[in-house]
């Protein structure tokens, strides 16, 4: 009926679509809620997360399981108080993901 | 001053945390603007996007040039009036990127 | 077409186990979840839960957690429910509902599972 | 749970007149991603249930246009602009929003 090649690359493209982690760049300051007058010098760094597509509309690719990783970075304060320090800073790195559902927000919360 | 190796990686991490065009998975309905009346299966499909870090948080990482892929895709239609069509879907795949300052929106639009 | 075909009725008595299965046709049976629904005599319906058949993924409604299985075999395109456990309050029909990307659309023609001593 | 509450429990209609049944969540149904995932289903005697609506308004394969589905937030109705003798039956409307998934008690719509 359907050519089986065109079926397998459909399917094989699919398959690269799934909720899974991938390499993702995220802004440091914001991940760990600094406030304005702190910088990171990267100001991104590359971890995982969970990103791709569910089989229902409804279903949210999220994480099920998270490691955190320790990137070297140069945190910055102003005013420029001292020479940019070198700091390990710890971010969360998806290593599992599953397509959930939603529950509904507790009505008293 | 600080450690050369340290240094090294540091740049390196930064150098993959650069805007530029990254793999990413897109719904293919709402990238088309098709009514609910209209899915793909799959309905994701994967394709490079610009995204990454810039320099300034004033900057966006924006596409400067894009070339337009082709995917089939099974397209069906509600209500259902035939066997799901085979049919080769055009997405945008970005080719090039770059940091940009965000463009002043007109004060009367 | 989709075509969704379940095992025949069951009587089981209560503390028994029963599992009920769930042939797919008429299209990719990996690419669409496989929900469970029950209806007891004259009553509502109620959702147990559902199963990717892709990866083997389940989610159970809370209420049947500890007592429900959901399975595929995915050379037959098969899903299978079984229910643990079972007193009187599980007499039902058991529907298996395939969901589309919008919402759960084919719906098995349902297995009557009887509890009774 | 959300709690779906189905009005009237039965409804008696006369052919070619109109009908239309109401539904009612305890929470909103407005899901993270925008949508409203209210869905109505019709159980013909004796058959299994069969989708009519979907995400509020959109009509399934092979359902009539005299079915419609409006609504929005907690409110929702479905409207048969003229019933026939085949839209006998108990009508259900459900949230496929929030786990768990969870149906209205359901309408049963007799002919006079």
């Known amino acids: 009926f359907y050519d089986i090649e065109t079926l397998k690359v459909i399917d094989e493209e699919w398959q690269r679509t799934q909720c899974s982690p991938r390499e993702t760049c995220v802004e440091v300051a914001s991940e760990l809620g600094k406030s304005t007058n702190t910088f990171f010098k990267p100001p991104c760094v590359n971890v995982f997360r969970c990103g791709g597509c569910c089989n229902e509309e409804s279903l949210i690719c999220m994480n099920t399981s998270t490691s955190y990783i320790s990137k070297q970075l140069f945190e910055i304060s102003v005013p420029l108080t001292s020479v940019p320090e070198l700091v390990p800073v710890k971010v969360a790195n998806h290593t599992g993901c599953k397509c959930l559902p939603t529950a509904p927000r507790h009505p008293y919360s | 001053f600080y450690d050369i190796e340290t240094l090294k990686v540091i740049d390196e991490e930064w150098q993959r945390t650069q805007c530029s065009p990254r793999e990413t998975c897109v719904e293919v309905a709402s990238e088309l603007g098709k009514s609910t009346n209209t899915f793909f299966k799959p309905p994701c499909v994967n394709v490079f996007r610009c995204g990454g870090c810039c320099n300034e948080e004033s900057l966006i990482c924006m596409n400067t040039s894009t070339s337009y892929i082709s995917k089939q895709l099974f397209e069906i239609s509600v209500p259902l009036t035939s066997v799901p069509e085979l049919v080769p879907v055009k997405v945008a795949n970005h080719t090039g990127c770059k940091c940009l300052p965000t463009a002043p929106r007109h004060p009367y639009s | 077409q989709v075509q969704l075909v379940q095992s025949g009725p069951e009587v089981k008595k209560p503390g028994a186990s029963v599992k009920v299965s769930c042939k797919a046709s008429g299209y990719t049976f990996t690419g669409y979840n496989m929900h469970w629904v029950r209806q007891a005599p004259g009553q509502g319906l109620e959702w147990m839960g559902y199963?990717?058949?892709?990866?083997?993924?389940?989610y159970y409604n809370q209420k049947f957690q500890d007592r429900v299985t959901l399975t595929v075999d995915k050379s037959t395109s098969t899903a299978y429910m079984e229910l643990s456990s079972l007193r009187s309050e599980d007499t039902a029909v058991y529907y298996c509902?395939?969901?589309?990307?919008?919402?759960?659309?084919?719906w098995g023609q349902g297995t009557l599972v009887t509890v009774s001593s | 749970d959300i709690v779906m509450t189905q009005t009237p429990l039965s409804l008696p209609v006369t052919p070619g007149e109109p009908a239309s049944i109401s539904c009612r969540s305890s929470?909103?149904?407005?899901?993270?991603?925008?949508?409203?995932?209210l869905h109505w289903y019709l159980q013909k005697p004796g058959q299994s249930p069969q989708l009519l609506i979907y995400?509020?308004?959109n009509r399934f394969s092979g359902v009539p246009d005299r079915f419609s589905g409006s609504g929005s937030g907690t409110d929702f109705t479905l409207k048969i602009s003229r019933v026939e003798a085949e839209d006998v039956g108990v009508y259900f409307c459900?949230?496929?929003?929030?786990?768990?998934?969870?149906f209205g008690g359901g309408t049963k719509v007799e002919i006079k």
């Open positions: 199963i990717d058949p892709y990866n083997g993924d389940t």
């Open positions: 459900s949230q496929g929003t929030h786990v768990p998934r969870t």
């Open positions: 995400k509020v308004s």
């Open positions: 929470q909103s149904l407005v899901h993270i991603n925008g949508n409203t995932y």
């Open positions: 509902i395939r969901a589309g990307y919008y919402a759960m659309d084919y």
